[in-house]
């Protein structure tokens, strides 16, 4: 995943014992917040593993890369990063592992240069539909976001709202069509059982989509047709049993695509014939000779590429009168 990185070698650290002296005065434009490390040369601020409960108010205006990882932020309110003057340079924001369970509408407003956002490893029980779009208008101003990293944001089962987690995430991605410029979307490790059918059609600029380590059983209703720029599609570690003709044709039609299908429990019966034929011909699947049958038991561990149509049978379904109890 693409987290903001820093080339900074020298960070000025704001000593905690100075905090009370500084807070009595108006904040200086380029001071370093308490409990953070700052490098103006690298345009980077790191407030990492500090158990912060809110975003520091006195972030320096020069900040381009902001790490707020390993904190206890809980809630990201509207305008959490709105400042006067605005943080006009902030391009990469990493909030991973900061115990966020709620991100409210407009949380990232007034960040005109924000290109990378990482909210991974936060139990997001309540992600506002307008978290990224900032308004509830049917068409919002385009977001500058190019990379959105949302790996492992599923909350524990007992903390989930009484609604579809997939639906909540997708609503935030699609609201106001604000994310039309998004190029990388990572949604790994979120227990997704399905992918709502309209989501990909409305993210036409995607180059990289990571859906690995979910629980996707089928892609039957998912269309990749519009994603003409898609370069990588990660579907490893799901529960896929077979890919059907429609999906195979759409993937084959994408000019730059590389597809990753490792670690899915492929069912090698008569329904697998089209996929096996396609695998033998296609160049888009990476490591395709690693794909092996998981079921039925008689086919277990066989390499898909080595199957032929005679191997792929389905047990006949007996009429009720012939079935044994």
């Amino acid at each position: 995943s693409s987290s903001p990185t820093s080339s900074a070698s020298s960070f000025s650290s704001s000593a905690p014992f100075l905090a009370s002296a500084v807070s009595a005065q108006p904040p200086l434009p380029d001071q370093c917040p308490a409990l953070c490390e700052c490098s103006e040369a690298a345009r980077t601020v790191k407030c990492v593993n500090r158990n912060l409960t809110e975003v520091p108010t006195d972030l320096p205006a020069y900040v381009r890369n902001l790490f707020l990882t390993g904190n206890q932020l809980a809630v990201l309110p509207a305008g959490a990063f709105a400042r006067r003057p605005p943080l006009a340079e902030l391009a990469a924001l990493n909030l991973s592992g900061s115990r966020l369970d709620e991100v409210r509408a407009g949380a990232f407003e007034h960040l005109p240069s924000l290109r990378q956002l990482d909210l991974s490893h936060n139990p997001l029980a309540d992600l506002s539909p307008f978290a990224f779009s900032g308004s509830n208008a049917s068409v919002s101003a385009p977001s500058p976001l190019v990379e959105l990293i949302l790996n492992h944001i599923v909350p524990p089962e007992d903390e989930r709202q009484n609604r579809s987690f997939e639906g909540m995430v997708v609503a935030a991605l699609l609201a106001g069509r604000a994310l039309q410029g998004l190029r990388r979307l990572e949604l790994a490790s979120n227990h997704f059982l399905y992918l709502p059918r309209d989501v990909l059609a409305q993210l036409p600029s995607l180059r990289h989509l990571d859906l690995s380590n979910n629980s996707l059983v089928s892609l039957t209703y998912v269309s990749f047709r519009n994603l003409t720029h898609l370069e990588s599609l990660h579907l490893e570690d799901n529960a896929l049993k077979v890919l059907h003709n429609g999906t195979l044709a759409e993937l084959q039609g994408l000019p730059h695509i590389r597809v990753f299908l490792d670690n899915n429990p492929w069912v090698c019966d008569c329904h697998m014939a089209d996929m096996v034929t396609w695998l033998k011909e296609t160049e888009v699947v990476q490591g395709k000779d690693r794909l092996t049958c998981a079921y039925p038991e008689k086919m277990r561990n066989r390499v898909l590429l080595e199957l032929n149509s005679a191997d792929l049978d389905c047990d006949p379904i007996l009429p009720p009168s012939l079935q044994t109890s």
Epitope: E236, D237, D262, N263, P265, G287, D289, R290, L291, T292, C293, A294, R300, N301, R302, V303, L305, E306, L307
Partner: antibody, heavy 116, light 107 residues
Framework: QVQLQQPGTELVKPGASVKLSCKAS????????MHWVKQRPEQGLEWIGN????????NYNERFKSKATLTVDKSSSTAYMQLSSLTSEDSTVYYC?????????WGQGTTLTVSS | QVVLTQSPAIMSASPGEKVTMTCSAS?????IHWYQQRSGTSPKRWIY???KLTSGVPVRFSGSGSGTSFSLTISSMEAEDAATYYC??????????FGGGTKLEIK
């Protein structure tokens, strides 16, 4: 029935190389990956690497990349593992195993002794 | 990569006794497999996909668990069950990893 036949013992000198064999029968050799597993006395199982007999593609455990080389001979349905620059640390039992999600058939193992 | 930890390392049980051993994963896995290795022989796949018995395995064996916690249970210990049992993570891509094993002895 599926069988993986391995020689019972190999004795080699320190610094030399050895090529362990695993002859498969009872199934289509090219349809399954072949794995190699190391087991030191009274210790657990350690995956060394695997090879696709159909095309020769291999994967290795990082720890064995400079120690083991996997090959196959399709005509005789035999998988090989060459171990190089042998030391006493390499003296132990090596198994071949057919697998994918799991290892459904295992050879009897070859006991390698490295001694001058 | 996922680390599998088995406990206990060694245990003993009397004939007829119920036996449970565990396999704990460092992060969530979908399934695990169990292998039985009797002294002086090669391992045999015993249970696969957490709970499915390999053909020929006695029904006194069962497997269960999910996420990071899995177990193998013998409902009534018999002498032939004395062996070392290894768990392995469900995967079809490298690396394949095993637990350290649980050695089961008969009292």
């Amino acid at each position: 029935q599926v069988q993986l036949q391995q020689p019972g013992t190999e004795l080699v000198k320190p610094g030399a190389s050895v090529k362990l064999s695993c002859k498969a029968s009872g199934y289509t050799f090219t349809s399954y990956w072949m794995h190699w597993v190391k087991q030191r006395p009274e210790q657990g199982l350690e995956w060394i690497g695997n090879i696709n007999p159909s095309n020769g593609n291999t994967n290795y455990n990082e720890r064995f990349k400079s120690k083991a080389t996997l090959t196959v001979d399709k005509s005789s349905s035999t998988a090989y593992m060459q171990l190089s620059s042998l030391t006493s640390e390499d003296s132990t039992v090596y198994y071949c195993a057919r697998g994918g999600w799991d290892f459904d058939y295992w050879g009897q193992g070859t006991t390698l002794t490295v001694s001058s | 990569q996922v680390v599998l930890t088995q406990s206990p390392a060694i245990m003993s049980a009397s004939p007829g006794e119920k036996v449970t051993m565990t396999c704990s994963a460092s992060s969530s896995v979908r399934y695990i497999h169990w292998y039985q290795q009797r002294s002086g022989t090669s391992p045999k796949r015993w249970i696969y996909d957490t709970s499915k018995l390999t053909s020929g395995v006695p029904v006194r064996f069962s497997g269960s668990g999910s996420g990071t916690s899995f177990s193998l249970t013998i409902s009534s210990m018999e002498a032939e069950d004395a062996a070392t049992y290894y768990c392995q993570q469900w995967t079809s891509k490298p690396p394949w990893t095993f637990g350290g094993g649980t050695k089961l002895e008969i009292k």
